[in-house]
């Protein structure tokens, strides 16, 4: 999906008001310096591409993020404010549904959510030069 035509300001507002709080809740008890950010993005569409991938695609050691509250609200934001996004989702979630279970908070998942927080922060500051 090409995120170029999303309403970035509305997605940003939803992130700041709600999604960010859910990410913090997920990470509660974890030091903010515990993980190094290794995933980066260069502009808002790219950031959303990376955010979608990290949130909804199972990775080795962390297959459960797509069933978390922040993931549901992320999906809702992309579906509402990215034209045609919901039409691209036909097989994406179905394919991994059998493998997903909530409440398996592994260290790998915490690391992945830490990466997500970094991507979202970058999404909110699109005019900053890439480090």
């Amino acid at each position: 999906y090409d995120f170029t035509n999303c309403d970035f300001e509305k997605i940003k507002a939803a992130y700041l008001s709600t999604i960010s709080k859910d990410l913090i809740t997920y990470m509660s008890g974890t030091k903010s310096t515990e993980f190094n950010n290794t995933v980066s993005c260069s502009n808002r569409p790219h950031c959303l591409t990376e955010i979608q991938s990290l949130t909804f695609n199972p990775t080795a050691g962390c297959a459960s993020l797509a069933k978390e509250m922040f993931a549901m609200k992320t999906k809702a934001a992309l579906a509402i404010w990215c034209p045609g996004y919901s039409e691209t989702q036909i097989n994406a979630t179905q394919a991994m549904k059998k493998r997903r279970k909530r409440k398996v908070t592994t260290n790998k998942c915490l690391e992945q959510v830490s990466q997500l927080q970094g991507l979202w922060r970058r999404f909110n500051r699109p005019l900053l030069k890439q480090q």
């Epitope: 008001s17 859910d22 509250m69 999906k75 934001a77 579906a79 179905q94 549904k97």
Partner: antibody, heavy 121, light 108 residues
């Protein structure tokens, strides 16, 4: 304008199943989660689960797993909830409600009028 | 699961009286995830307050909401007859989503 129109009241036998519907109009059905809520007579509200019509993704309250099955048909913009192995405990009004962002806070905005299910022999 | 406990369960207020309904949450949640709904008999619940303190469209300004962590409240500065209803708090912080038991507010 946004509307959620639910199917009519049902009188069903114990042990049977019932499928109630929630037809959406006035918005892009596939882009919004649909929630289902139970209310027993004179009682409070209980969240059953939700479905994202875009890909059929679902989340259930563990209490209703095996009791409720949520589906959605994008072609008719209709969400469905099937209740199985009915008992008197399932006699209630069931609401569907759209999940959305309201002033950047995520919750439900539009609700259906409710479908009354009575389980009786 | 997160348990929401409302108090009182039932109350009556005179016109013009200040009313406060509380919602106690079993574990701390973000204020952005606490909402209030109003329900009148035989009708669907209506969104009333979002994110602890933001009034839904059409809600009179005599209503307000506040709170944080585990303690939230809905206040009516001056009770009116049309405010008689049942009010529910709800959390969107973690699954399963849960509601308070409701507070039935009657007019004296």
């Amino acid at each position: 304008q946004v509307q959620l129109q639910q199917s009519g009241a049902e009188l069903v036998r114990p042990g049977s199943s019932v499928k109630i519907s929630c037809k959406a109009s006035g918005y892009t059905f596939s882009s919004y989660w649909v929630n289902w809520v139970k209310q027993r007579p004179g009682q409070g509200l209980e969240w059953i689960g939700q479905i994202y019509p875009g890909d059929g993704d679902t989340d259930y309250n563990g209490k209703f797993k095996g009791k409720a099955t949520l589906t959605a048909d994008k072609s008719s913009s209709t969400a469905y909830m099937q209740l199985s192995s009915l008992t008197s405990e399932d006699s209630a009004v069931y609401f569907c409600a759209r999940g959305t962002y309201y002033n950047n806070y995520y919750g439900t905005d539009y609700w259906g009028q409710g479908t009354s299910v009575t389980v009786s022999s | 699961e997160i348990v929401l406990t409302q108090s009182p369960a039932l109350m009556a207020a005179s016109p013009g009286e200040k009313v406060t309904i509380t919602c106690s949450v079993s574990s701390s949640i973000s204020s952005s995830n606490l909402h209030w709904y109003q329900q009148k008999s035989e009708t669907s619940p209506k969104p009333w307050i979002y994110g602890t303190s933001n009034l839904a469209s059409g809600v009179p300004v005599r209503f307000s909401g506040s709170g944080s962590g585990t303690s939230y409240s809905l206040t009516i500065s001056s009770m009116e007859a049309e405010d008689a209803a049942t009010y529910y708090c709800q959390q969107w912080s973690s699954y399963p989503l849960t509601f308070g038991g409701g507070t039935k507010l009657e007019i004296k």
